[in-house]
Amino acid sequence: LKGQEFAPSHQQVYAPLRADGDKPRAHLTVVRQTPTQHFKNQFPALHWEHELGLAFTKNRMNYTNKFLLIPESGDYFIYSQVTFRGMTSECSEIRQAGRPNKPDSITVVITKVTDSYPEPTQLLMGTKSVCEVGSNWFQPIYLGAMFSLQEGDKLMVNVSDISLVDYTKEDKTFFGAFLL
Amino acid sequence: LKGQEFAPSHQQVYAPLRADGDKPRAHLTVVRQTPTQHFKNQFPALHWEHELGLAFTKNRMNYTNKFLLIPESGDYFIYSQVTFRGMTSECSEIRQAGRPNKPDSITVVITKVTDSYPEPTQLLMGTKSVCEVGSNWFQPIYLGAMFSLQEGDKLMVNVSDISLVDYTKEDKTFFGAFLL
Amino acid sequence: LKGQEFAPSHQQVYAPLRADGDKPRAHLTVVRQTPTQHFKNQFPALHWEHELGLAFTKNRMNYTNKFLLIPESGDYFIYSQVTFRGMTSECSEIRQAGRPNKPDSITVVITKVTDSYPEPTQLLMGTKSVCEVGSNWFQPIYLGAMFSLQEGDKLMVNVSDISLVDYTKEDKTFFGAFLL
């Protein structure tokens, strides 16, 4: 109905107009991660707060067992920030000895799981080498982009090292998605 | 009205359909900060350009006195990037002496102020240790997420050290929000 | 039509309501860059995958020759992530000799080209000094914000050094835009 005067007519209009307020949306915030069994050769998934504080799910977007469940097909904007913190890696020690080395790193992956598809799909990845020289370091990795998702798709956030995730504040580490 | 043919009817439809073009939106860009009085124990707030160059506010989203004023309740996507630049901190000097140390850091916080609520709410935080070894360093912190806001809420961007903000270009440091 | 019961009436309603599903949208993903001639004094532009894997363009948003072509005036959210990777710059070697130095850097710019306007407009810039001490480093720069664009505008992503871009995975380096 773009650019057209919007007026009642006896001709039916099939464009799926819908109220913005009823679109699936979620913003999840960090909680302390408890030690769990991880799948071999797969980064562990974070679990999330979905209703307290700044966190919410609405309009059939549900959170369950580390996954956001997509209730309706369409284009979604998906985002996450994970703040990592740690102590100096041995990277700097090896370096001081003058030998080149593979740096330590921190990685965040937003992953899509489709039940009818055997392998998860990596939608977004942020990965950073960490060869910090100070004794304590901290830094965020932010990701966000638009993807076409199908009803029933599941989204999760995986990280390279769950023990480095800063779980202290809901504004530092979060995960969200909304239907465009 | 999802998935339903949209046709005139004698039955009233209550879904709040509205034109996308009339939704509150703003994109603010950096201006040079002049030395001012800061609130005690609170990171200083940045002030912004709201009408020149790439900056704009529209549809009742107003900017005044460092705040974006939310004109209508709903779910908003809020984002900011702050580019910092500085010179080597003494962090590296201490480090060379072999003593562990608390690193210098740079922090951005997007804060919500609700008049009826005594304390500001931190919506988003990006914080990064800075133990750079080069003489001059520069780097951005980017934040963005969706929040449910109420009419009358105010948004601001606070930074850990206002004098390290790169104010030279409107594409390096910015702040925006739009109703979904 | 905000906050108003939506019912047919003999009075014409002019608000340009339109289905969300028919808005211009694109998500482009990295491909290996082939050596090309760059414009003098301008960062080289990346070219992109627009239809395989996670990449898509829809609703008249077209990709051609490194540019996303804007088919309709309006407010767009534009985003990109570029993951860079490299080897230690001589920056650290110079530093070890105790001399301050200009750091190496990595930069991403999202640029708008308007045919009727002689100069491209830089919409977003992420720039970071790189004085890594490890032998190999990698890190992403993420950008995203909302801009008012005109039909016919073209968007591209420019980088400071095309040879440092990580082209190995579609989730590491990407570029997208969607009409709000």
């Epitope: - | 900060q33 901190s89 903000v165 | -």
Partner: antibody, heavy 118, light 107 residues
Framework: QVQLVQSGAEVKKPGASVKVSCKAS????????MHWVRQAPGQGLEWMGW????????NSAQKFQGRVTMTRDTSISTAYMELSRLRSDDTAVYYC???????????WGQGTMVTVSS | DIVMTQSPSSLSASEGDRVTITCRAS??????LNWYQQKPGKAPKFLIY???RLQSGVPSRFSGSGSGTDFTLTISSLQPEDFATYYC?????????FGPGTKVEIK
């Protein structure tokens, strides 16, 4: 409004030290870098260094290293610049200046004339 | 250290004239270039930052341009109060350095 008020003129002998003060008002003293810039009679401007009043961290131009000491007293919002082993070519007006960013000088003190003469 | 040069070192102009002062850096300083005005016996006054952005309260007849190594300060229509010495200063890296100044005198 933002104001920087410096101490009065000084006359010193070669080899002595001078300490110039700069009292700040109208802004959060600990939030902004304080710079010191000097200007010899009839000459241009020369940056000496800065202090970050919050951390006390300093950075000075190579030519002054070992001779200049920048300190601050946050309780009275005052910065100090001490220059030791004075020579006749240190005769200059010494300015403190504060910037909204660490790389520029928005507001200047009125200047302190330091004369080095035997 | 980054060396800043200015030209001319002095110029004579009349009220209403358009005046241009150039500043060159010995290496690229991006847009980290500031301009100051100084009158005899007074502290300098901050005019322009980021090469081209006017400091609050500075008249619009002042403008700046340039990026990298070459910069310009322009006064579109010289006023009596504009007769002074103008300095450029790079804020790109330490030590921050000033140009030698350009003295604008009454013709």
């Amino acid at each position: 409004q933002v104001q920087l008020v410096q101490s009065g003129a000084e006359v010193k002998k070669p080899g002595a030290s001078v300490k110039v003060s700069c009292k700040a008002s109208g802004y959060t003293f600990t939030g902004y870098y304080m710079h010191w810039v000097r200007q010899a009679p009839g000459q241009g401007l020369e940056w000496m260094g800065w202090i970050h009043p919050n951390s006390g961290g300093t950075n000075s131009a190579q030519k002054f290293q070992g001779r200049v000491t920048m300190t601050r007293d946050t309780s009275i919002s005052t910065a100090y610049m001490e220059l030791s082993r004075l020579r006749s070519d240190d005769t200059a007006v010494y300015y403190c200046a504060v910037g909204g960013s660490y790389d520029a000088f928005d507001i200047w003190g009125q200047g302190t004339m330091v004369t080095v003469s035997s | 250290d980054i060396v800043m040069t200015q030209s001319p070192s002095s110029l004579s102009a009349s009220e209403g004239d358009r005046v241009t002062i150039t500043c060159r850096a010995s290496q690229s300083i991006s847009s980290y270039l500031n301009w100051y005005q100084q009158k005899p016996g007074k502290a300098p006054k901050f005019l322009i930052y980021g090469a081209s952005r006017l400091q609050s309260g500075v008249p619009s007849r002042f403008s700046g341009s340039g990026s990298g190594t070459d910069f310009t300060l322009t006064i579109s229509s010289l006023q009596p109060e504009d007769f002074a010495t103008y300095y450029c200063q790079q804020g790109y890296s330490s030590p921050f350095t000033f140009g030698p100044g350009t003295k604008v005198e009454i013709k």
